[in-house]
Interface confidence: low
């Protein structure tokens, strides 16, 4: 912390300008009064203050606004946002997504700091839900936001949101992410025809149940092997071998090279012999001919 | 620059176990998902699990669920995956791996054996 010392004479600062670069710490705490520096934070970014000088312009900032910044302060912060803690963050209240994207136009190309998650936690449950602005926003800098978040965030996700997410920024989902947004993306695009339907919805599917897959193997998609990869396996294996043949389309061809691999093993495992072999691939493992099925899970559910 | 390098594996009957450790270090900050991948010769990377550093929420494919635990020591900069009830399965290079907060995993170890056999 900086000494409180008295200004000396003819340095006080009438205007935030580049002659404070040559104030030592000592005279920027004497000379700068917190008011004017807070009217005038556009100015602190376009000054080449060194790090030493934006603490103590922070420590001013600090002892005017001790229970943190007004959002007209917050969203002129620019590079000083870098100095601020998680802890002085969680004391703001930032409402506007200008000042949202400011910020994270200073952290741009860098990894997502505690700084960032913070402000990004305090913005989106100010809103109380993560809305489709702020969602195309927050893929914008950090395309796998939405994969960064615990399935209980994503229940907040509105299906509105939906539209904004763009098939990379699920990439590094796992499947219980998926299990929460598939549902949203079903209802998102309920309205669109079925071709159409089926390019935004594919991205989602490793959300997908049983029926619904069913349901997609009566319309002509012609699912790619890359996504039939990321398929939930218990969704996967009642299907049929028509039912994936007629899901797959001339993709139905890619499964010998995945057949031991999952989904596709355990599937090929739990389809007859000689239904495998009408595809004519050359598939191998399913329930020789002759032998009795026992589905156990019917049995118990019935008792 | 970031730097992972695994210990712990090695050769252990079936039903037995094991305990992976993953020393991280050159990172900026605690802000990384940690993931444990394997490959068995022949095979693809498949990742085996992982843990956000946020809220340690982890992440198990069925074919270990139940049988395998990551754990992280944030203090320590370590990662952990306990290995119970080992199958000849099992059997691959373990690599530990770790991830920008909501990007690919990007940073890899150089791997430990290990090897389930009696």
């Known amino acids: 912390e900086v000494e409180k010392t008295a200004c000396p004479s003819g340095k006080k600062a009438r205007e935030i300008d580049e002659s404070l670069i040559f104030y030592k710490k000592w005279e920027l705490e004497a000379c700068v009064d917190a008011a004017l520096l807070a009217t005038q934070m556009d100015r602190v970014n376009a000054i080449p203050f060194t790090y030493e000088q934006l603490d103590v312009l922070k420590h001013k900032l600090d002892e005017l606004y001790p229970q943190g910044y007004p959002e007209s302060v917050i969203q002129h912060l620019g590079y000083l946002f870098l100095k601020m803690s998680p802890e002085d963050i969680r004391k703001w209240n930032v409402t506007s997504l200008e000042t949202l994207k400011a910020l994270l136009e200073v952290n741009k190309g860098h990894e997502m700091s505690p700084q960032v998650a913070t402000l990004i936690d305090r913005f989106v449950k100010g809103r109380g839900q993560l809305d489709k602005d702020t969602l195309d926003t927050l893929t914008a800098f950090y395309p796998g936001y939405l994969c960064s978040l615990s399935p209980e965030e994503l229940s907040s996700v509105p299906p509105s949101s939906i539209w904004a997410v763009r098939p990379q920024d699920l990439d590094t989902c796992d499947p219980r992410q998926l299990d929460v947004l598939y549902p949203k993306a079903r209802l998102a695009f309920q309205n669109m025809n079925g071709s159409e339907y089926f390019v935004k919805i594919q991205s989602f599917l490793g959300g997908a149940p049983t029926e619904d897959l069913k349901a997609l193997s009566q319309q002509n998609v012609s699912m790619d092997l890359a996504t039939f990869m990321k398929l939930r396996t218990d969704a996967v294996l009642p299907l049929t071998v028509a039912e994936v043949q007629k899901l797959l389309g001339p993709h139905v061809e890619g499964l010998k090279a995945e057949e031991r691999h999952r989904p596709v093993r355990d599937w090929i495992l739990r389809q007859r012999q000689d239904d495998l072999d009408t595809l004519g691939l050359g598939l191998q493992g399913g329930i020789p001919n002759g032998y009795l099925v026992l589905d156990l899970s019917m049995q118990e559910a019935l008792s | 620059e970031v730097q992972l390098v695994e210990s712990g594996g090695g050769l252990v009957q079936p039903g037995g176990s094991l305990r992976l450790s993953c020393a991280a270090s050159?990172?900026?900050?605690?802000?990384?998902?940690m993931g444990w991948f394997r490959q068995a010769p022949g095979k693809g990377r498949e990742l085996v699990a992982s843990?956000?550093?946020?809220?340690?929420?982890?992440y198990y494919p069925d074919s270990v669920e139940g049988r395998f635990t990551i754990s992280r020591d944030n203090a320590k900069r370590m990662v952990y995956l306990q290995m119970n009830s080992l199958r000849a399965e099992d059997t691959a290079v373990y690599y530990c791996?770790?991830?920008?907060?909501?990007?690919?995993?990007?940073?890899w170890g150089q791997g430990t054996q290990v090897t389930v056999s009696s």
């Open positions: 843990i956000n550093s946020f809220d340690s929420i982890t």
């Open positions: 791996a770790a991830r920008k907060k909501g990007l690919a995993f990007s940073y």
């Open positions: 050159g990172f900026t900050s605690n802000f990384y998902s």
